[in-house]
């Protein structure tokens, strides 16, 4: 009755994410059978997050729009193992958007999911960010000092990378 | 007011190159992206790519790739598209025009007609 | 790539007239939709965007709706100066390609 009942609110749980993934790769987190996390596929998976690369060329409000309507946000970035699981799936001559950008103008970044903006834990390159026009955030590869982010016009078509929570079941 | 005023008519063999300019006034120059787009004499509108005037930084229809390139020359407030190994396909008018805050074209240049002809 | 199918490629039409012209993306395209109006010779104006915003000093009788990838540009009476083409663009991802264009003519 107890295993029913659990599989029961397994199907009703995926159904919710059906519309916009309707493949999951789930893995037994632990030792017990009862708990499953899943990232929808072909996400990636890492500590408690999925990551997508999106390829097609978007202006940064467009990325995060189609980031929202899968059910994720423009990436956060809160540590360097983080960053440095990210950039295993990214192509060296292209550039990606962050979920970070400067709105005002006034040098106030903020994270798409509100997360407080620490200058301690971020990754820019050297002399970056450097132009008031250049409101969102991108991470890019250069050769000097391998991955780094950049500041770049919002409007510049770019890939990007969404991130979710992963689910669990 | 906001301007953009585009170089004269061109008239090239195939096989070479054009470069169009596209001179910006009235705002400021490196806050707007630019963009090209072309028309084929009696046809419909063709996006080229865009050009960020601060940076430089371009994105580009991959129709195009390789063949064009967009540059700016901030001390003059001009944007430039060169097209290589012209076609007689390539005969067409091409506009530059600033997307706006709203991410749209709210200005555009006047049209500069290329033709290639042997 | 995203393509953009516009109907009718002409209509003919009287003044007065109330003239409808259809946009179908092949994907969604979230409302990040533009319509312009364009004159033999002369660069394209911008009419709407974001689907159904007026642009600055566009006459009230232009109106848009529509959502996911199905778009409509609505002239509630036509005007003399009306008579011109008119071409739908979209923006969600590049390349951002055009409808092929209506031609509104005069009956």
């Known amino acids: 009755n107890f295993m029913y009942s659990k599989t029961v609110k397994r199907l009703s749980k995926l159904r919710e994410y059906q519309q916009y993934h309707p493949s999951l790769t789930c893995v037994m987190e632990g030792k017990d059978i009862e708990d499953w996390s899943c990232c929808p596929t072909p996400w990636t998976s890492f500590q408690s997050s999925c990551y997508f690369i999106s390829t097609g060329m978007q202006s940064w409000t467009k990325s995060q729009k189609n980031c929202s309507v899968m059910g994720a946000d423009l990436v956060v970035i809160n540590t360097r193992e983080e960053q440095d699981f990210i950039i295993q799936n990214l192509k060296r001559n292209s550039s990606y958007f962050l979920g970070l950008s400067d709105p005002g103008g006034r040098r106030h970044w903020q994270w798409v999911d509100q997360t407080p903006y620490n200058e301690n834990v971020t990754f820019w390159h050297s002399g970056e960010p450097n132009n008031l026009d250049e409101r969102c955030a991108i991470i890019n590869f250069r050769s000097s000092e391998e991955w780094g982010w950049n500041d770049i016009h919002c409007h510049v078509p770019q890939k990007s990378i969404c991130k979710m929570k992963k689910i669990y079941i | 007011q906001v301007q953009l005023v585009q170089s004269g008519a061109e008239v090239k063999k195939p096989g070479a190159s054009v470069k169009v300019s596209c001179k910006a006034s009235g705002y400021t120059f490196t806050s707007y992206i630019i963009h090209w787009v072309r028309q084929a004499p009696g046809q419909g509108l063709e996006w080229m790519g865009t050009?960020?005037?601060?940076?430089?930084?371009?994105s580009y229809n991959q129709k195009f790739k390789g063949r064009v390139t967009m540059t700016r020359d901030t001390s003059t407030s001009t944007v430039y598209m060169e097209l290589s190994s012209l076609r007689s396909e390539d005969t067409a008018v091409y506009y530059c025009?600033?997307?706006?805050?709203?991410?749209?074209?709210?200005?555009w240049g006047q049209g500069t007609l290329v033709t290639v002809s042997s | 790539d995203i393509q953009m199918t516009q109907s009718p490629s002409s209509l003919s039409a009287s003044v007065g007239d109330r003239v409808t012209i259809t946009c179908r993306a092949s994907g969604n395209i979230h409302n990040y939709l533009a319509w312009y109006q364009q004159k033999p010779g002369k660069a394209p104006k911008l009419l709407l965007y974001?689907?159904?915003t007026l642009a600055d000093g566009v006459p009230s009788r232009f109106s848009g709706s529509g959502s996911g990838t199905d778009y409509t540009l609505t002239i509630s009476s036509l005007q003399p100066e009306d008579f011109a083409t008119y071409y739908c663009q979209h923006f969600w991802s590049t390349p951002y390609t055009f409808g092929g264009g209506t031609k509104v003519e005069i009956k």
């Open positions: 025009a600033r997307m706006g805050d709203n991410e749209y074209f709210d200005y």
């Open positions: 974001d689907a159904e």
């Open positions: 050009i960020y005037p601060g940076a430089g930084d371009t």
